[in-house]
Interface confidence: low
């Protein structure tokens, strides 16, 4: 779940609406109940017939999906709407990078030892922003309305709880989960920050205010300088409100514009290879703002050469998932400063 292990995640939206994986039971590794096929259900509101263009990933399969903006992927488990007819899916690989997990908070001492607060309008980003402003690395949401701040040393003594324990709806957003009773959903504060200096070999950059929608009049910049001679970006999510909301990619050394994307001109769906070792990303939104934004993964490449068979920026075969064997919660060099 670390921000620097994007290859481990199949989801980049906080509610897993972008999950297109193949888990077809409500629990992982064969656990839980089998899902019904989306194209074989007649009685329910959501079926492959209600998703003819595949926008929600429904089809002739029984994989968990989130077609209705719920808090996480789910599936039908019974044909009639009586008793238990649908279930949330517990998908270990479907947690956005930057979400570190669900932790037990016994209160004495608190799982995150920094400042805390409560809000009846709590969202994940409200808490992230609070902890970012306080200078902490981590933010934890609990019970739908409480926010705690802490550092990675807190997590060293923390105790992981089952992912499904963090099932409380955020008071300020019905599509987000904010921990649970005595359970902290912990995030890195760099998620949705408006600036950052990224030097880790790979990572994820989210639009400002993510997982909330980005706000109006945002002007944000991120510097990417991972080891290597070139960069590869992959946009996992890109939803900008209109052409006046714009993301620019510039060569950090020369300042020259390499690519620009906006609400009318989205980026390619596959990896985008750039022959520069240092990149400056700038995002601006207009006075109206408000859309889900973007999530992109980057990785440094040793080889600066472009693929001669494909024009620059075209979709190429995605790289194999990054090795997550060394992911840990200890402090990492190159983590972005709190913005």
């Amino acid at each position: 779940g670390s921000l620097h292990s994007p290859g481990l995640s199949e989801c980049f939206q906080v509610n897993g609406a972008d999950y297109r994986g193949h888990q077809n039971r409500t629990g992982p590794r064969g656990a839980g109940r089998p899902c019904l096929f989306w194209d074989q259900t007649q009685q329910h509101s959501y079926s492959s017939a209600s998703d003819p263009h595949g926008r929600w990933g429904l089809g002739a399969h029984n994989f968990c999906r989130n077609p209705d903006g719920d808090v996480q992927p789910w599936c039908y488990v019974a044909e009639t709407e009586e008793g238990i007819y649908w279930r949330y899916c517990d998908i270990p690989s479907c947690h956005m990078p930057g979400y570190l997990g669900c932790f037990v908070d016994s209160g004495a001492p608190p799982a995150l030892s920094g400042p805390s607060g409560t809000s009846t309008k709590l969202t994940v980003q409200v808490c992230l922003r609070f902890c970012r402003m306080k200078g902490y690395q981590l933010a934890g949401v609990e019970a739908g309305y409480a926010c705690f701040c802490g550092s990675e040393s807190d997590l060293a003594r923390g105790r992981l709880a089952p992912a499904t324990d963090c099932d409380q709806i955020c008071f300020g957003h019905p599509g987000q989960l904010c921990g649970g009773d005595g359970r902290l959903g912990v995030y890195e504060v760099s998620v949705g920050s408006c600036q950052g200096n990224w030097t880790a070999p790979q990572g994820v950059i989210y639009s400002p205010d993510f997982p909330d929608e980005y706000g109006p009049d945002r002007n944000c910049s991120w510097a990417l300088g991972p080891p290597g001679a070139a960069l590869e970006l992959t946009f996992r999510l890109f939803e900008l409100a209109d052409p006046r909301d714009r993301l620019e990619l510039r060569d950090a050394a020369s300042g020259s514009l390499l690519r620009a994307f906006d609400g009318a001109r989205p980026p390619p769906s596959g990896p985008l290879r750039l022959g520069t070792a240092a990149l400056l990303l700038t995002f601006r939104s207009d006075a109206r703002g408000h859309a889900q934004g973007f999530a992109l993964t980057y990785r440094g490449l040793q080889d600066a050469a472009e693929d001669p068979e494909a024009p620059e920026g075209s979709a190429q075969t995605p790289a194999a998932p990054l090795d997550g064997a060394n992911v840990s919660c200890s402090p990492r060099p190159g983590a972005p400063p709190a913005a």
């Epitope: 109940r33 509101s45 209705d68 808090v71 009639t80 008793g83 409380q168 019905p174």
Partner: antibody, heavy 117, light 111 residues
């Protein structure tokens, strides 16, 4: 904290109409079906019906079909139970309850309806 | 409709003793490995409170002296050591199919 808060007690005359409410908070309102349960004075629990949150389509027990209407306002996370013409036999405590795998895991505090001439 | 029949109607048990309540469904409420039977406790002036769900699962926060068992048509709620605060009416309920129905209730008192 999950809460179902029901509207206050009502005293009505036979033939009058009434609409009582149940407001959900602290959870995703549209993710959980909402049910209504009647308890007449000194008696047991009777399941009246439920409403499917996404479609807003209600389903009623036979005894309550045509007698009550269950409805929904998702924008304010509120479910309703209404009568167009009350009878003395409608005097009871009415509960809303949220249903999930675990049964009716959260209940409203109840609304007392008294119908008397 | 599935009819739920609870027995006994009332039960008087000494403090610390075991209390057992039975519920019989007019047809099976079990399918696909699940028994769609729940138990509730209702104290005077309060709404019902979920105790046991899906026949045998203890709801969070409920003391472990409460337990549920059974499948098919016959189910049992057991209070292993009755406490004063357990005085209440207990109801079974099925959600196997529409309409959902409750048992008539069992009143538990201290002997």
């Amino acid at each position: 904290e999950v809460q179902l808060v029901q509207s206050g007690a009502e005293v009505k005359k036979p033939g009058e109409s009434l609409k009582i409410s149940c407001k959900g908070s602290g959870y995703s309102f549209t993710s959980y079906p909402m049910h209504w349960v009647r308890q007449m004075p000194g008696k047991g629990l009777e399941w009246m019906g439920w409403i499917k949150m996404y479609s807003g389509v209600p389903t009623y027990a036979d005894d309550f079909k045509g007698q009550v209407t269950i409805s929904l306002d998702k924008s304010i996370s509120t479910a309703y139970l209404q009568w167009s013409s009350l009878k003395a036999s409608d005097t009871a405590m009415y509960y809303c309850a949220r249903n999930w795998d675990k049964g009716f895991d959260y209940w409203g505090q109840g609304t007392t309806v008294t119908v008397s001439s | 409709d599935i009819v739920m029949t609870q027995s006994p109607d009332s039960l008087a048990v000494s403090l610390g003793e075991r209390a057992t309540i039975n519920c019989r469904a007019s047809k099976s409420v079990s399918t696909s490995g699940y028994s769609y039977m729940h138990w509730y406790q209702q104290k005077p002036g309060q709404p019902p409170k979920l105790l046991i769900y899906l026949a045998s699962n203890l709801e969070s926060g409920v003391p472990d002296r409460f337990s549920g068992s059974g499948s098919g048509t016959d189910f049992t709620l057991t209070i292993s050591s009755l406490q004063a605060e357990d005085v209440a009416v207990y109801y079974c309920q099925h959600i196997r199919e529409l309409p959902y129905t409750f048992g008539g209730g069992t009143k538990v008192e201290i002997k």
